[in-house]
Interface confidence: low
């Protein structure tokens, strides 16, 4: 039997992973290979309760490997190089069950910042232009914008328009978030609106 | 230490049902298989079936299907095991083991049921 | 099913002596396991994988054999060793144990 559709499991960059395996029950486990983008990672032979026979054929990840008492891969310090396919075989006697998994890699999103170019306009009307970011983005990073809960913009640009003498008090939250890490940073209309305001009176006088 | 406690003994009418629990401690609970193996009166061990506590997979002895059924609660480290339309030949001491790498390696106190009119 | 056949289904001997047991199964099977049953307790795993002893088994016990034909033997029967003795096979669903070889002192 084989599952054909691959686990997508994902891991954080200098973090540990498991790839959790489930063996068939009640069959004697006679070995287990886990390979790793098709090249053999480790083989593994039951031989006491306590200690298997671990085979560590690839020396690269071989220091960062380890098993549980289950055969679960555990992988630890992830490095970007560990994305990939992961496939363990078990063999009993009668069949060989395989066990398929994706492994992506992904930073912890750090330092989420908002920058803000605006302008007022004669009618005191405050256009708000917005831009988030995260260090080293990358393309599994997505972003949003919500205004009480609402969600405003899919990107991370986001252009509003602010009228002080109609419009209550309003935070905008930029959303940064990938598949292990999720951050928030959120801006007030009114007090963006409020230094836009200075800097233009600023330059009247 | 690795310990499993079963439940007390139970004294049943035929065609009633017993439920068995076996309460699993100093290990990982869903990191090995629960067997369960029964002993009549005088005789012989007979393997009645396991379960994955990890993800609740099951396998029978045939002669058993349809009247055992295996469960395992995550949440407090159990295993039970129900028979059901009992007859006076299910009749035995009824014990949980834990199975290490390949073999049974720590097991239950055992559980009389008697099935008696 | 696969039956394995334990002989002799009980046993005497004096202390010192050397005792073997065998266990046949009615078709190849990988591997035999050994369990130990004293009266009124569990069973205790005792040769596992048909010739590798169990955590706190004497050396005195060993096993051996291939296919259908297994032979557990004791070198040197000392009283704490008065029990029953199966095997069992994990090659087939449903997995059988032996009947049992009861073992007494002279």
């Known amino acids: 039997q084989s599952s054909l559709t691959p686990l997508m499991v994902n891991g954080i960059l200098g973090e540990s992973v498991t790839l959790p395996l489930e063996f068939p029950a009640g069959e004697k486990v006679n070995f287990i290979t886990w390979l790793f983008n098709e090249t053999s990672l480790a083989f593994i032979v039951p031989h006491e309760t306590k200690s298997p026979e671990i085979h560590v054929t690839n020396p690269k990840q071989g220091k960062r490997l380890n098993f549980t008492q289950s055969y679960s891969l555990q992988l630890s310090n992830l490095k970007m190089e560990d994305t990939g396919s992961y496939r363990a075989q078990i063999s009993t006697k009668t069949s060989a069950k395989l066990s398929s998994y994706t492994l992506r890699i992904l930073r912890q999103l750090r330092n989420i910042q908002v920058t803000n170019h605006s302008q007022l306009f004669q009618n005191m009307t405050c256009e708000l232009h917005l831009t988030c970011s995260v260090e080293d983005a990358d393309d599994n990073v997505s972003f949003r914008w919500e205004a009480l809960g609402n969600t405003l913009s899919s990107q991370p640009n986001l252009t509003v328009s602010w009228d002080p003498r109609i419009s209550s008090e309003q935070d905008y939250t930029c959303i940064a978030e990938n598949a292990v890490s999720n951050l928030s940073f959120s801006v007030s209309a009114q007090k963006l609106c409020e230094d836009v305001k200075i800097q233009y009176t600023d330059t009247k006088m | 230490q690795v310990q499993l406690v079963q439940s007390g003994a139970e004294v049943k009418k035929p065609g009633a049902s017993v439920k068995v629990s076996c309460k699993a401690s100093?290990?990982?609970?869903?990191?090995?298989?629960i067997e369960w193996v029964r002993q009549a009166p005088g005789q012989g061990l007979e393997w009645i079936g396991v379960i994955n506590p990890g993800s609740g997979g099951t396998n029978y002895n045939e002669k058993f299907q349809g009247r055992v059924t295996l469960t395992a609660d995550k949440s407090i480290s159990t295993a039970y095991m129900e028979l059901s339309r009992l007859r006076s030949d299910d009749t035995a001491v009824y014990y949980c083991a834990r199975r290490g790498w390949d073999y049974f390696d720590y097991w239950g106190q055992g559980t009389l049921v008697t099935v008696s009119s | 099913d696969i039956q394995l056949t334990q002989s002799p289904s009980s046993l005497s001997a004096s202390v010192g002596d050397r005792v073997t047991i065998t266990c046949q199964a009615s078709?190849?099977?990988?591997?035999i396991y050994w369990y130990q049953q004293k009266p009124g307790k569990a069973p205790k795993p005792w040769i596992y994988?048909?010739?590798n002893l169990a955590t706190g088994v004497p050396s005195r016990f060993s096993g051996s054999g291939s296919g259908t034909d297994y032979t557990f033997t004791i070198s040197s029967l000392q009283p704490e060793d008065i029990a029953t003795y199966y095997c069992?096979?994990?090659?087939?669903?449903?997995?059988?144990f032996g009947q049992g070889t009861k073992l007494e002192i002279k």
């Open positions: 069992q096979q994990w090659d087939n669903n449903p997995y059988t």
């Open positions: 100093g290990y990982a609970f869903t990191n090995y298989l």
């Open positions: 994988r048909t010739s």
């Open positions: 078709q190849d099977v990988s591997y």
